[in-house]
């Protein structure tokens, strides 16, 4: 009857026309909801002319459904076993699971004014560009929509600048009719042990971001993984939201609508510096704002996002070196709520829930040519706003899945 | 020492397009930003052009814009200015000059004179 | 433009200051003795001396304005000074339109 059974598991998920992981693979039959909660500052007039500790309040959940678009492109190549697509991007608000509308303001960092001298850091470029900063009447805060905020706004200062650049601006811009890919994808057709494992992203086997094996793409897009897990294996995924493969390890065992899941969490030693997990040494990419590489707990993708001074953490600023999170007031990291996990069917290796948490935080330094930043007497990791993605096995599908698979198994 | 040693200065036909060269030595010359300023007989002193340490941005002033391309070569240590569509009031000493950051000059060339004349 | 004196006038061993308004960043003060002569830098950014500028020449700057100090002029600082900067506009540096020192 194992046999069988594995025999059964083994066929079904080959990423290939026809199984039953191949359907749920192209267009996934979970509901997935992007929740966001936005850090309002409280203070800006305090911080920009006192350098004072910055006073946020976060205000959410405002809540988007995302990747209900099927996978496209989608070819198969018999040669390598492999299966490459892309993922297209797209969001509708949920106005019933929000505690406002798109059309809520928030006092945040101005994206622009605080990227504009860590992109340009020569003083003649700097000097030039704050007098169209003033010009604008642009200064270190402003106020924004959701909508402006997360998916763009035409920027009044950018707009001034004369030179080919774009000028929109947002933390997800371009977000809606784009694609995450070309992912090309192992199909497991020859080897069951590498189904879904990433053979290459945008053609290329390394991300160029990091140096050393950092720059590796390593397991899959987390949406399942090689079937028969072990509680002992780490699960290595990729996300591109964070520019970086990243692993899970096994927490505990959980049942999910009956059906026995191995819960796998993002451990602390990940987001480590490198003084207390060697192996980060590759993620740290910069010596100032990284206190020589002893801060821990946020992430520089700078080079992955145009030079723009982007750093992701965990919400709250969870598992980071209290350095970080000093000159910031409001903030309550907590475990539970902040955290990554996923669920993950072991037979099968399918995720059947997960909680994706990350912060998006913009890194703003003292500027002496930048007037509206001149005031500042030390470099803020700004945070901006934390997303909690979800996803859950539908009651429907569960029952279908008790009865072709962990029912047989019983 | 610092040196910025400036040519292609003489007289010019209007309508026509001049390049001004400056050769510098006895510094780092691809951490400066370079400007040139010109000097009309009897006049003040009239910002022309500026560039960055790697050429990636310019900037012109207003007489000037449109007809002049400020470019430089890291390699060879100089800066160049092309002056288009040459005006009678292009006419004076073209200086260049260095920036010691901010817009704040901190040496100058000796100068080469152009006459703008039918 | 940057607004500065057209003229000033002081006897030798006298200290003399120059103001400078109207600009946006930094500021340089130039000296040039004679009309086709190269200007020499004797302040950049606001106060600093090049090496081979006596200490007599001093620069320093507030808000919006600079002033530049000769402590104890003497008749070789005849010339005209020049101040430079930004005036906050997207046309290049601007200068003064010159003081002219006389050394009485």
């Known amino acids: 009857g194992d046999m069988l059974i594995e025999k059964t598991i083994k066929r079904e998920v080959v990423l290939e026309e026809g199984t039953t992981a191949f359907k749920n693979w192209v267009k996934t039959g979970t509901t997935v909801y992007r929740q966001f909660w936005i850090f309002d500052v409280q203070n800006p007039d305090d911080v920009a002319k006192n350098s004072s500790k910055i006073k946020v309040k976060q205000r959410g959940p405002y809540t988007y459904r995302v990747r209900y678009l099927a996978k496209e492109n989608i070819t198969q190549d018999p040669e390598d076993h492999t299966v490459s697509f892309v993922q297209p991007n797209g969001a509708i608000f949920e106005p019933s699971l929000s505690v406002g509308t798109e059309d809520d303001n928030f006092t945040v960092l101005n994206l622009a004014v605080a990227a504009a001298p860590h992109i340009y850091q020569n003083s003649f470029v700097q000097v030039v560009l704050n007098s169209l900063i003033k010009k604008s009447k642009s200064s270190m805060f402003q106020t924004r929509s959701l909508k402006e905020l997360l998916w763009g706004y035409k920027d009044p200062f950018l707009s001034l600048v004369p030179y080919p650049i774009s000028t929109t601006v947002g933390v997800f811009y371009p977000y809606n009719d784009t694609v995450d890919g070309v992912y090309k994808v192992f199909n497991g057709k020859d080897n069951i042990s590498k189904v879904a494992i990433i053979e290459s992203y945008k053609g290329k086997r390394n991300l160029s971001y990091w140096p050393s094996y950092c720059d590796m793409i390593n397991g899959t897009d987390a949406a399942s993984f090689p079937p028969f897990v072990e509680k002992s294996r780490t699960l290595r995924f990729f996300s591109s939201d964070i520019c970086r493969s990243i692993y899970a390890v096994f927490g505990s065992e959980i049942d999910l609508k009956g059906i026995p899941v191995y819960r796998f969490v993002l451990p602390a030693n990940a987001f480590a510096s490198p003084l207390q997990n060697p192996d980060n040494h590759c993620f740290c990419t910069e010596k100032v704002i990284s206190n020589n590489c002893t801060s821990y707990g946020v992430l520089d993708i700078g080079k992955c996002k145009e030079g723009k001074p982007v750093y992701i953490s965990l919400p709250h600023f969870l598992h980071a070196s209290p350095d970080v999170s000093e000159p910031i007031e409001g903030l309550h990291p907590n475990e539970d709520e902040h955290r990554t996990y996923l669920d993950v069917e072991p037979i099968t290796g399918f995720t059947l829930q997960f909680a994706k948490r990350l912060q998006v935080n913009i890194l703003v330094k003292p500027a002496r040519k930048i007037e509206a930043l001149k005031n500042l007497k030390r470099p803020y990791i700004v945070p901006i706003l934390w997303l909690n993605e979800t996803g859950t096995i539908g009651d429907e599908k569960a029952e279908m899945f008790k009865t072709q698979v962990t029912g047989k198994i019983k | 020492a610092v040196t910025l040693d400036e040519s292609g200065g003489g007289l010019q036909t209007p309508g026509r397009a001049l390049s001004l060269v400056c050769k510098a030595s006895?510094?780092?010359?691809?951490?400066?930003?370079m400007f040139w300023v010109r000097q009309a007989p009897g006049k003040g002193l009239e910002w022309v052009a500026g560039?960055?340490?790697?050429?990636?941005?310019?900037l012109y002033g207003a007489a000037v814009k449109g007809r002049a391309t400020i470019s430089r070569d890291n390699g060879q240590s100089t800066v160049r200015l092309q002056l288009n569509n040459l005006r009678a009031e292009d006419t004076g000493t073209y200086y260049c000059?260095?920036?010691?950051?901010?817009?704040?000059?901190?040496?100058w060339g000796h100068g080469t004179e152009v006459i703008v004349s039918s | 433009a940057l607004t500065q004196p057209s003229s000033v006038s002081a006897n030798p061993g006298e200290t003399v200051k120059i103001t400078c308004s109207g600009g946006?960043?930094?500021y340089g003060w130039y000296q040039q003795k004679s009309p086709g002569s190269a200007p020499v830098t004797v302040i950049?950014?606001?106060?600093k001396r090049p090496s081979d500028i006596p200490s007599r020449f001093s620069g320093s700057a507030s808000g919006s304005t600079a002033t530049f100090t000769i402590t104890g002029v003497q008749a070789e600082d005849e010339a005209v000074y020049y101040c430079?900067?930004?005036?906050?506009?997207?046309?290049?540096?601007?200068f003064g339109a010159g003081t002219t020192l006389t050394v009485l």
């Open positions: 000059a260095r920036d010691s950051g901010a817009v704040s000059i901190d040496a």
């Open positions: 006895g510094f780092t010359f691809s951490s400066y930003n």
């Open positions: 560039i960055d340490d790697d050429g990636s941005f310019t």
């Open positions: 946006d960043s930094d």
């Open positions: 950049y950014q606001n106060d």
């Open positions: 430079g900067g930004w005036d906050g506009s997207y046309d290049g540096a601007v």
